[in-house]
């Protein structure tokens, strides 16, 4: 169950999709990717306060145990719930080819 | 690709499966779960240094961008890669029932 979407920490502070612009050099891809030369990387960033966008039962347990034992059990973490595919034009041993990556860009986020 | 399983921070410091013992009270389940009265919760805890157990391309990107922009992009996070099911004996409006939860106990871990 995706729990509450209301962020008690204030607007934009909780787990959500962010876009970070990155060059091929930033990503360490310059030696094997030809295009795009810049990627709009969508990623999940933000806090996961109690029951905010809890992905599943495990996330709810983690929230409860983190409250009890904060030094032992970390709070849930903001990670992708699903991905958008992206195509890269890349160099290979046999020449230039296209490759679609299904797990490159975050589509939406949850806490786990 | 699950990248390196060698932890550069020392034994047991990186993302791995831990077991945390929790009572129904700890979990906030005392009013609806009858059994078990204590749960051995398996969860994913630990650091995710560069490329350690990187779940996918997104995790690799996150590592690269965290290195470049640590204040903006968080490091990858240690989360379940899969789950073990668990059955609970629970109270319902119509009496006692069994319910299997597929997303309660972490089975193994990766960084994302």
């Amino acid at each position: 169950a995706r729990n509450g979407d209301h962020c008690p920490l204030g607007p934009g502070r909780c787990c959500r999709l962010h876009t970070v612009r990155a060059s091929l050099e930033d990503l360490g891809w310059a030696d094997w990717v030809l295009s795009p030369r810049e990627v709009q990387v969508t990623m999940c960033i933000g806090a996961c306060p109690s029951q905010f966008r809890a992905a599943n039962m495990h996330a709810q347990i983690k929230t409860s145990l983190h409250r009890l034992k904060p030094d032992t059990v970390p709070a849930p973490c903001c990670v992708p719930a699903s991905y958008n595919p992206m195509v890269l034009i890349q160099k290979t041993d046999t020449g230039v080819s296209l490759q679609t990556y299904d797990d490159l860009l975050a589509k939406d986020c949850h806490c786990i | 690709a699950r990248n390196g399983d060698h932890c550069p921070l020392g034994p047991g410091r990186c993302c791995r499966l831990h077991t945390v013992r929790a009572s129904l009270e700890d979990l906030g389940w005392a009013d609806w779960v009858l059994s078990p009265r204590e749960v051995q919760v398996t969860m994913c805890i630990g650091a995710c240094p560069s490329q350690f157990r990187a779940a996918n391309m997104h995790a690799q990107i996150k590592t690269s961008l965290h290195r470049l922009k640590p204040d903006t992009v968080p490091a990858p996070c240690c989360v379940p890669a899969s789950y073990n099911p668990m059955v609970l004996i629970q109270k319902t409006d119509t009496g006692v029932s069994l319910q299997t939860y597929d997303d309660l106990l972490a089975k193994d871990c990766h960084c994302i």
């Epitope: 295009s35 795009p36 030369r37 958008n84 595919p85 195509v87 034009i89 296209l98 | -």
Partner: antibody, heavy 118, light 108 residues
Framework: QVTLKESGPGILQPSQTLSLTCSFS??????????VSWIRQPSGKGLEWLAL???????RYNPSLKSRLTISKDASSNQVFLKITSVDTADTATYYC??????????WGQGTLVTVSA | EIVLTQSPALMAASPGEKVTITCSVS???????LHWYQQKSETSPKPWIY???NLASGVPVRFSGSGSGTSYSLTISSMEAEDAATYYC?????????FGAGTKLELK
Amino acid sequence: QVTLKESGPGILQPSQTLSLTCSFSGFSLSTSGMGVSWIRQPSGKGLEWLALIYWDDDKRYNPSLKSRLTISKDASSNQVFLKITSVDTADTATYYCIQSPWDWFAYWGQGTLVTVSA
Amino acid sequence: EIVLTQSPALMAASPGEKVTITCSVSSSISSSNLHWYQQKSETSPKPWIYGTSNLASGVPVRFSGSGSGTSYSLTISSMEAEDAATYYCQQWSSYPLTFGAGTKLELK
């Protein structure tokens, strides 16, 4: 395996509207970076780029024809469409549909011959 | 718009001969935005060289590309019969996307 197939009326008369369909398989137009272009080639002549549509519905047109061109897509049914209004004999050509990821004409359809004749 | 001028328009080469086709661009572009395509008669064009010098998958290694700014070239180190075709340069630096008029390479 990527395939693209163009379909059109074959023959039409001056002043009519040309409607072309590109049906493709082996890739998705919902994939970030993916695009589909239309290019035409009159018999024995060179290549002329007409229009391009990307995954995010960004559309680009050749300004010399822009007022007559409309490109659209139905990503769910793997189809891209091109309409050219007010055709005349100069629009007689083979029309190609091309998979266009980012900045490359990567896979070309076999082409469909369109003849404008009175 | 960016104009691409290819030369020669038509040429013939013997098997084993070195062949160079040039593409002159009307304004300077990044080498990553200059591509080449091969077209044989009655067939669709095929991508041949991406970003000035990167051979498309399956293109024989006797082909190479080079250049920068406004001057680019495609070279065949040793002509073979299957290389007879028309070659087009194309820029993806700015819209409208444009092609050269083509160089028709025949086997002598």
